[in-house]
């Protein structure tokens, strides 16, 4: 399955929008920094086949979408930027979904790497618990925004590697 060119453009747009969403200086939140232990090995395109990598990407974007779709998120960000960001993620989900469905239909496709899906889920669990622990403070959201920019960058790079594999 070939992801459309618009997909990588959407990915870049999402990153730009997330960058614009910052409301406070990251320097004022240095004491709130946290290592969420991004599962970098799950973004190593050489580690698994394309079908599996796309499932991991889908999980990553889906969890990001869910994280920014909460009431707490709505209260934290400027509404129009948040809506645009969510729209970009939603479009990416649709592209990835179509690819995963296509791969599911191919009988010889190896089973999804369930531990990779779980690693992504655990990563977002750490982020969720951090926000709860910090009572969804502006600095906590700023730290999370910066972290999600990192993870979206990893996603973008993985997609580039997948396209090169083609």
């Amino acid at each position: 399955c070939d992801l459309p060119q618009t997909h990588s453009l959407g990915n870049r747009r999402a990153l730009i929008l997330l960058g614009q969403m910052g409301r406070i200086s990251p320097f004022s939140c240095l004491k709130d920094r946290h290592d969420f232990r991004i599962p970098q090995e799950e973004f190593d395109g050489n580690q698994f086949q394309k079908a599996q990598a796309i499932s991991v990407l889908h999980e990553m974007i889906q969890q990001t979408f869910n994280l920014f779709s909460t009431e707490d998120s709505s209260a934290a960000w400027e509404q129009s930027l948040l809506e645009k960001f969510s729209t970009e993620l939603y479009q990416q989900l649709n592209d990835l979904e179509a690819c995963v469905i296509q791969e599911v239909g191919v009988e010889e496709t190896p089973l999804m790497n369930e531990d990779s899906i779980l690693a992504v889920r655990k990563y977002f669990q750490r982020i969720t618990l951090y926000l709860i622990e910090r009572k969804y403070s502006p600095c906590a959201w700023e730290v999370v925004r910066a972290e999600i920019m990192r993870s979206l960058s990893f996603s973008t790079n993985l997609q580039k590697r997948l396209r090169r594999k083609d």
């Epitope: 889908h58 889906q62 990835l96 995963v100 469905i101 599911v104 669990q125």
Partner: antibody, heavy 119, light 108 residues
């Protein structure tokens, strides 16, 4: 509010199959994995597996791979679990439960369907 | 798979008594992925405690959770009649996800 609706009971004959349903409402169905859990009378809970309604990918507990098949119908926002070659060991209450994170993990359960396997 | 062993299987407590239920894991479980559910007869389980020590919405403050590694517990500081139920621990630290066999807590 989030709701997962399951039929109350199913009576099936040994060797037959049954398809259980779990109709979701109150949230975007495709955004969360749906899980299935088995509970035999007076016993503990067993995780059967999960399905992502967005694309249909499944992850199973090895113990149930040859017993259960998970599917979804996005148009009717319903998750299904087919149980095959039923025996008395399959007589149990089967719950669907929605995934999530933090305080949303298995925060929403269906009422459960009691499956009775009897001749 | 990670086997969760709960003890005792059944226990009864008087109103006002302190109660501790334990959950022992066959191998180490990260505390972020250890949950507790309450279930009353004829009902589906209810999320009670998430990530070892966080109370779910609506759970009375007399409940608390603690633990790490292979040893976890749920404590009720002062037993009340409405606390009579079965309690299950659950882990999603690794596949397949597992539940404990449960502790049935009765009121004396």
């Amino acid at each position: 509010q989030v709701q997962l609706q399951q039929p109350g009971a199913e009576l099936v004959k040994p060797g037959a199959s049954v398809k259980l349903s779990c109709k979701a409402s109150g949230y975007t169905f495709t955004n969360y994995w749906m899980h299935w859990v088995k509970q035999r009378p007076g016993q503990g809970l067993e995780w059967i597996g999960e399905i992502n309604p967005s694309h249909g990918r499944t992850i199973y507990n090895e113990n149930f791979k040859s017993k259960a098949t998970l599917t979804v119908d996005k148009s009717s926002i319903t998750a299904f679990m087919q149980l095959s070659s039923l025996t008395s060991e399959d007589s149990a209450v089967y719950f669907c439960a929605r995934g999530g994170l933090g305080p949303a993990w298995f925060a929403y359960w269906g009422q459960g369907t009691l499956v009775t396997v009897s001749a | 798979q990670i086997v969760l062993t709960q003890s005792p299987a059944i226990m009864s407590a008087s109103p006002g008594e302190k109660v501790t239920l334990t959950c022992s894991a066959g191998s180490s479980v990260d505390s972020s992925y250890l949950y507790w559910y309450q279930q009353k007869p004829g009902s589906s389980p209810k999320l009670w405690i998430y990530s070892t020590s966080n109370l779910a919405s609506g759970v009375p403050a007399r409940f608390s959770g603690s633990g790490s590694g292979t040893s976890y517990s749920l404590t009720i500081s002062s037993m009340e009649a409405e606390d009579a139920a079965s309690y299950f621990c659950h882990q999603w630290s690794s596949y397949p996800f597992t539940f404990g066999s449960g502790t049935k807590l009765e009121i004396k």
